[in-house]
């Protein structure tokens, strides 16, 4: 069976939107009006992995682009990147672990924990116009809480 996917946008708990920053990076900034069209639309695929009531494994692709968020070690540090894939083979139900995030719902907010690096989360900073990254703390000054807005396909 084909993998189930939905289209969505994400905003952090400060209401910053996510946009492309160069070819292989996302950044977070406040958008309004027509600028909202800049925000990236994700194709969130529900993939194989450890699942519970509030924890669902997903892959985050960029809609109509063969790019997926992935988590890899760079200079011995877990790092978030946009990785190019062969569109003929993705998305798939059994995604490689670097592409998998545990979508965790807490109090109507979402966290995205790396399956490859437990306790590392998709993060934004308080500052405007700075990259989205993989952070190793929750509840500190880095932002790990997001809301999801559904986009019709």
């Amino acid at each position: 069976a084909p993998v189930r996917s939905l289209n969505c946008t994400l905003r952090d708990s400060q209401q910053k939107s996510l946009v492309m920053s160069g070819p292989y990076e996302l950044k977070a900034l406040h958008l309004q009006g027509q600028d909202m069209e800049q925000q990236v639309v994700f194709s969130m695929s529900f993939v194989q992995g450890e699942e519970s009531n509030d924890k669902i494994p997903v892959a985050l692709g960029l809609k109509e682009k063969n790019l997926y968020l992935s988590c890899v070690l760079k200079d011995d540090k877990p790092t978030l990147q946009l990785e190019s894939v062969d569109p003929k083979n993705y998305p798939k139900k059994k995604m490689e672990k670097r592409f998998v995030f545990n979508k965790i719902e807490i109090n109507n907010k979402l966290e995205f924990e790396s399956a490859q690096f437990p306790n590392w989360y998709i993060s934004t900073s308080q500052a405007e116009n700075m990259p989205v990254f993989l952070g190793g703390t929750k509840g500190g000054q880095d932002i790990t809480d997001f809301t999801m807005q559904f986009v019709s396909s």
Partner: antibody, heavy 118, light 107 residues
Framework: EVQLLESGGGLVQPGGSLRLSCAAS????????MFWVRQAPGKGLEWVSV????????RYADSVKGRFTISRDNSKNTLYLQMNSLRAEDTAVYYC???????????WGQGTLVTVSS | DIQMTQSPSSVSASVGDRLTIICRAS??????LAWYQQTPGNAPKLLIH???SLQSGVPSRFSGSGSGTDFTLTINSLQPEDFATYYC?????????FGGGTKVEIK
């Protein structure tokens, strides 16, 4: 008053290492992104590296990637740049700068000179 | 990487002149552009951020305009302390990049 004071520059042979420090005062260091920017003698400005307040997000210019490492100690209000495998073309005044709104450098240190020569 | 091209690379002007410096980005950077002033032996000083916003404490004779790929820094009525080198810098994406500089000399 915001102050940034770089130290650690000097003369080093090609292939050698150096660690620059930047002592910050007059603002809440732990809340700000920080940059290193360099300027070769008689040349323009070149961005080198950035680090987020928590230290989890770092980025580097291609010219220093794999050789330089940016870090910070928020308890000491200090920014660092570890420079390995130094080359003649790394000779420059190195400035640390506080990152302002959207990615500009709103305060700069006075700079420290790094000379790579045999 | 985004290339930033400044023109002119140098210019001679007199006190009281109105001066315009141009900065072009190799791709759209929205309004994520800053301008700096640097005098010999000193660190750069931020003049303008977000293309048009005057940094606190900077005289109002300095102004910035533009968005997308084309930006200008204008100095109305040059003062003796304005003879310096000016740099633009894009903050749209990493790696951040600077223009090559514009040296403003006394005619």
């Amino acid at each position: 008053e915001v102050q940034l004071l770089e130290s650690g520059g000097g003369l080093v042979q090609p292939g050698g290492s150096l660690r620059l420090s930047c002592a910050a005062s007059g603002f809440t260091f732990s809340k700000y992104f920080m940059f290193w920017v360099r300027q070769a003698p008689g040349k323009g400005l070149e961005w080198v590296s950035v680090i987020s307040p928590s230290g989890f997000m770092t980025r580097y210019a291609d010219s220093v990637k794999g050789r330089f490492t940016i870090s910070r100690d928020n308890s000491k209000n200090t920014l660092y740049l570890q420079m390995n495998s130094l080359r003649a073309e790394d000779t420059a005044v190195y400035y640390c700068a506080r990152v302002g709104y959207g990615g500009n450098s709103d305060y700069w240190g006075q700079g420290t000179l790094v000379t790579v020569s045999s | 990487d985004i290339q930033m091209t400044q023109s002119p690379s140098s210019v001679s002007a007199s006190v009281g002149d109105r001066l315009t410096i141009i900065c072009r980005a190799s791709q759209d950077i929205n309004r994520w552009l800053a301008w700096y002033q640097q005098t010999p032996g000193n660190a750069p000083k931020l003049l303008i951020h977000s293309a048009t916003s005057l940094q606190s404490g900077v005289p109002s004779r300095f102004s910035g305009s533009g968005s997308g790929t084309d930006f200008t820094l204008t100095i109305n009525s040059l003062q003796p302390e304005d003879f310096a080198t000016y740099y633009c810098q894009q903050a749209d994406s990493f790696p951040l990049t600077f223009g090559g500089g514009t040296k403003v000399e006394i005619k």
